[in-house]
Amino acid sequence: AFGISGVQKYTRALHDSSITGISPITEYLASLSTYNDQSITFALEDESYEIYVEDLKKDEKKDKVLLSYYESQHPSNESGDGVDGKMLMVTLSPTKDFWLHANNKEHSVELHKCEKPLPDQAFFVLHNMHSNCVSFECKTDPGVFIGVKDNHLALIKVDSSENLCTENILFKLSET
């Protein structure tokens, strides 16, 4: 997984434009897979898209997402997730100009083509969990996480801290 230590490992990214007034600490290209090692894949056209959670063929390249890491403006209440007491947030982009968005009304994870500055719905608080896994909590709806439901990504409400380790909201990041 690519957690705080990974962020510190990479050089700071230089950006000509800032997002919601802040620039990323760094950016990282990684494949995204579930706790059970299924791959998150994307099929995009100009006017439509699909996001799949599936087993990949042996020779098939894994789709990658560009994770842009930000320090949030709010101090972290939890240990291990922040830098200097602040929460880490990420945006996830599978290709240029497209970002994952949280649709809290529909409890869905969507892909939107948009320009910077990105809306709050595109930001997720990054949590480093056990077994080299991470989870993504909606900035706009605390307690709601990106998760897997019926072989698709969805928003899943986590009621208690014990449920933070539930497998369907855990993801692995890999450079391969």
Partner: antibody, heavy 126, light 106 residues
Framework: EVQLLESGGGLVQPGGSLRLSCAAS????????MSWVRQAPGKGLEWVSG????????YYADSVKGRFTISRDNSKNTLYLQMNSLRAEDTAVYYC????????WGGGLRYPFGYWGQGTMVTVSS | SYVLTQPPSVSVSPGQTASITCSGE??????AAWYQQKPGQSPVLVIY???KRPSGIPERFSGSNSGNTATLTISGTQAMDEADYYC?????????FGGGTKVTVL
């Protein structure tokens, strides 16, 4: 509606050069990887070359490597194939093809061809 | 370089099932696509990622891929299905087509 319109074909002598163009419309051209595929008279399809939509990386079949150059002008929504040192065996209909999906980070060519042009005929003969 | 092998021709009676094979080393580890080409026309994608049909392609077209062989199946073949069919895969960002199979509807 996705449209791909090839042009630039014709008769050329062995050793000569030709530049093919493919004018694209109906989609965000810069987002998609594009390829050239050819078909010799009475023969099957042969992939010739492809170009990324992410970083303009280029890829070639061994049969044309060092002789053909693929390029794109995203501001003009146009794909090109510069063909040099042409041989009789390059005689074919040349199709421009668009990937089915927008190219993702990580690059490489790996998607099926969702859309094809009508083709332009290249004849190499003395 | 990677090679895909198809039978040159397949004959089928109307309403019957036509199966076209495409063989290659460890073919099942790759995603296969299939294209239909009618005389004087450009190819059309009929199957991608082994089994998926693009919108507008009839349900009678289906695909499978395992081991060393991918197969395109046309169930209830119609006269309009008479065409050349090509399989295609990517091998390290190099496109590879099979030699093509002419399907004749008797």
């Amino acid at each position: 509606e996705v449209q791909l319109l090839e042009s630039g074909g014709g008769l050329v002598q062995p050793g000569g050069s030709l530049r093919l163009s493919c004018a694209a419309s109906g989609f965000t051209f810069s987002s998609y990887a594009m390829s050239w595929v050819r078909q010799a008279p009475g023969k099957g399809l042969e992939w010739v070359s492809g170009i990324s939509g992410i970083d303009t990386s280029t890829y070639y079949a061994d049969s044309v490597k060092g002789r053909f150059t693929i390029s794109r002008d995203n501001s003009k929504n146009t794909l090109y194939l510069q063909m040099n040192s042409l041989r009789a065996e390059d005689t074919a209909v040349y199709y421009c093809a668009r990937d089915l999906w927008i190219q993702l980070w990580g690059g490489g060519l790996r998607y099926p061809f969702g859309y094809w042009g009508q083709g332009t005929m290249v004849t190499v003969s003395s | 370089s990677y090679v895909l092998t198809q039978p040159p021709s397949v004959s089928v009676s109307p309403g019957q099932t036509a199966s076209i094979t495409c063989s290659g080393e460890r073919m099942g580890d790759k995603y296969a696509a299939w294209y239909q080409q009618k005389p004087g026309q450009s190819p059309v994608l009929v199957i991608y990622q082994d089994t998926k049909r693009p919108s507008g392609i009839p349900e009678r077209f289906s695909g499978s891929n395992s081991g060393n062989t991918a197969t395109l199946t046309i169930s209830g073949t119609q006269a309009m299905d008479e065409a050349d069919y090509y399989c295609q895969v990517w091998d390290s960002s190099t496109g590879v087509f099979g030699g093509g199979t002419k399907v004749t509807v008797l």
